[in-house]
């Protein structure tokens, strides 16, 4: 239904502080730099201008569309142009390009510092003085270093945040109480901000038909009783949520998720026997559950699906006559007779379906042609399944630090002109997917391992679009999503390449490296790494093994020695030779 | 962990009957699919028969249509193969599946475990 002022509206349907949230988040996601006063004095003044709404619709200016209301705030703040350079343009477009401009000049990677944790008692100090400035500062920190983290979600993790603040904060052991709970909810925060880019860039590179297959596909496998008519309607509406989120329409988004989170809630019987856990929680809680809600007890008996897709002599007609609708059910049946898959090789099967009728439903013997399609589908599924063994056993043996080395080294030999931070940062991702999902009952493996490679090597294709300097990263990148793991698992060493000169100093270190925490410790290591394979791209693991040996070995030395300057300063030069004959 | 182990196979001649058993170990089979294949000398392994978790389907390759029947007692932790009418060229090694998810049901990159295999001899 039409409102007459959509700002209220939305603050109707939210709530005050829902809506400060979600006008924060938007604030921080747009304008990256931007210092959190200034935000929430903004934020505040919206606030205000949204109450003023609500009180009489026919206000001055409270017909203006969210974009209109919210651009103009972002257009007036003083300083635009040297803070955020050609941004500023933007303010010369009438919506709705103003907008766009904005979203485009979002940045996946800004030069902002890490996320700095502050000691427990000096967080629990300004938590208890005002928890609200505080959860402020948090949704702030966050939405500007992930400017398309899922706003509602987002939201949901400050709620955890805040929850686990008031129990520890009371504890006599903040410390111990608070780390391991903040630890846990930064891991599950970093992961939903990967695959929420992920889903992004599908809608951004390939619109919403191509996001509405993934949904389609993730449903089917979680609500395997739904029928197609259920498992399109939930897909739709998740599409238009994610559109929105990923278009900076953060207030629809939340209220829109809320609707179809309540919609689920009422429709249980048609949709899963396992929803009514989540549905007894409040909102946000309710929705997060249901975004990764179990699957749901697959019928006894579903038949094999041959009969109407490969033996039926009508395919071709069924096809021409709503092409998307038969590859929709195709999708439907596929995934929801197999949870074990993972999305994307669910997509893999469907696009190839695709081509082939496209193929053979232009032949004289159309059934005769499709009629070999299954045998094609077997390369597709054998490879993920391989990977999911070849990797899995790696991890186990290698153990998650030994298996990034693995990953770094593989990566680093495929795209070797790729910046060292960003090789270390990926494969670091890239191996977390053997604690992640290599302990997990064999049929959750491979949706679990693809799916969330998917996503890193999204992040990948993000970084590298804005510099791009490897053909094999550009080559891999510029191809549909869903075949972008395959691509960079086929990848091998890039023979174009001209190695590194060695240099001394990327290999000398200091003892400052001795106080480091483990993972600085680990990053300062991967980065040397990095860079050995850089200077010899076609060195053995054995070699490279043997290199890495005595740089632990040495680090261990000079880090217990008495005088750990002199040690590293006469030492240093000895382990660089070593490194170099090594590789000789 | 699912084990499975056929029995039953033999040399018959052409028109004679047997019937395979797969017995499963290490976990119930009523939440997989079974499955039939077979490999004759010199060829690559093809499918023979399946059948759904709670027995409501069966599915058969046209070559055996009609002369072989799949059948399975999930109290019993087994899957059968009765073959009726055989001929010469249904001598194979005759191996039993099990996967927990199935679409297609004749495909063998959808069963997860597999048995030793059974030798089927039809001769004169």
């Known amino acids: 239904e039409a409102h007459k002022s959509e700002i209220a509206h939305r603050y109707n349907d939210l709530g005050e502080q829902h809506f400060k949230g979600l006008v924060l988040i938007a604030f921080s996601q747009y304008l990256q730099k931007c210092s959190y006063d200034e935000h929430a004095k903004l934020v505040q003044e919206v606030t205000d201008f949204a109450k003023t709404c609500v009180a009489d619709e026919s206000a001055a200016n409270c017909d203006k569309s969210l974009h209109t209301l919210f651009g103009d705030k972002l257009c007036a703040i003083p300083n635009l142009r040297e803070n955020y350079g050609e941004l500023a343009d933007c303010c010369t477009k009438q919506e709705p390009e103003r907008n766009e401009c904005f979203l485009q000049h979002k940045d996946d990677n800004p030069s902002l510092p890490p996320f700095e944790r502050p000691e427990a008692e000096a967080m629990c100090t300004s938590f208890k003085e005002n928890p609200t400035t505080f959860m402020g500062h948090y949704l702030h920190e966050v939405a500007r270093r992930h400017p398309y983290f899922y706003a509602p979600e987002l939201l949901y993790y400050a709620e955890q945040y805040n929850e686990i603040l008031t129990q520890c904060c009371a504890e006599a052991d903040k410390e111990s109480c608070l780390t391991p709970k903040l630890d846990g909810v930064k891991e599950k925060a970093l992961v939903s901000s990967v695959r929420q880019r992920m889903k992004c860039s599908s809608m951004q590179k390939f619109g919403e038909r191509a996001f509405k297959a993934w949904a389609v596909a993730r449903l089917s496998q979680t609500f395997p009783n739904a029928d197609f008519a259920e498992i399109t309607k939930l897909a739709t509406d998740l599409t238009k949520v994610n559109k929105e989120c990923c278009h900076g329409d953060l207030l629809e988004c939340a209220d829109d998720r809320a609707e179809l989170a309540k919609y689920m809630c009422e429709n249980q019987a048609t949709i899963s026997s396992k929803l009514q856990t989540c549905c007894d929680k409040p909102l946000l809680k309710k929705a997060h559950c249901l975004s990764e809600v179990e699957h749901d007890t697959m019928p006894a008996d579903l038949p094999a699906i041959a009969a109407d897709f490969v033996e039926d002599q009508e395919v071709c007609k069924n096809y021409a006559e709503a092409k998307d609708v038969f590859l929709g059910t195709f999708l439907y049946e596929y995934s929801r007779r197999h949870p074990d898959y993972s999305v994307s090789l669910l997509l893999r099967l469907a696009k190839k379906y695709e081509a082939t009728l496209e193929k053979c439903c232009a032949e004289a013997n159309p059934p005769a042609c499709y009629g070999t399609v299954l045998a094609e589908f077997q390369p597709l599924v054998e490879e993920p399944k391989n990977l999911v063994k070849t990797n899995c056993d790696l991890y186990e043996k290698l153990g998650e630090y030994g298996f990034q080395n693995a990953i770094l080294v593989r990566y680093t030999q495929k795209a070797p002109q790729v910046s060292t931070p960003t090789l270390v940062e990926a494969a670091r991702n890239l191996g977390r997917v053997g604690t992640k999902c290599c302990t997990l009952p064999e049929d959750q493996r491979l949706p679990c391992v693809e799916d969330y490679l998917s996503a890193i090597l999204n992040r990948v294709c993000l970084l590298h679009e804005k510099t791009p300097v490897s053909e094999h990263v550009t080559k891999c990148c510029s191809g549909s999503l869903v075949e972008r793991r395959p691509c960079f698992s086929a990848l091998t060493v890039d023979e174009t390449y001209v190695p590194k000169e060695f240099k001394a100093e990327t290999f000398t270190f200091h003892s400052d490296i001795c106080t480091l925490p483990e993972k600085e410790k680990q990053i300062k290591k991967q980065t040397a790494l990095a860079e050995l394979v850089k200077h010899k791209p076609k060195a053995t693991a054995e070699q490279l093994k043997t290199v890495m040996d005595d740089f632990a070995q040495f680090l261990d030395t000079c880090c217990k020695a008495a005088d750990k300057d002199t040690c590293f300063s006469t030492e240093g030069p000895n382990l660089v030779t070593r490194c170099k004959d090594a590789l000789a | 962990e699912v084990q499975l182990v056929e029995s039953g196979g033999g040399v018959v001649q052409p028109g004679g009957s047997l019937r395979l058993s797969c017995a499963a170990s290490?976990?119930?089979?009523?939440?997989?699919?079974m499955g039939w294949f077979r490999r004759a000398p010199g060829k690559e392994r093809e499918f023979v028969a399946a059948?759904?978790?709670?027995?409501?389907?069966?599915y058969y390759a046209d070559s055996v249509k009609g002369r072989f029947t799949i059948s399975r007692d999930n109290s019993k932790k087994t899957a059968y193969l009765q073959m009726n009418s055989l001929r010469p060229e249904d001598t194979a090694l005759y191996y039993c599946?099990?996967?927990?998810?199935?679409?297609?049901?004749?495909?063998?990159?959808?069963?997860?475990?597999w048995g030793q295999g059974t030798l089927v001899t039809v001769s004169s």
């Open positions: 599946a099990a996967g927990r998810y199935s679409a297609w049901y004749s495909q063998s990159y959808e069963y997860d475990y």
């Open positions: 290490g976990s119930t089979i009523s939440s997989y699919v």
């Open positions: 059948i759904s978790r709670s027995g409501g389907y069966t």
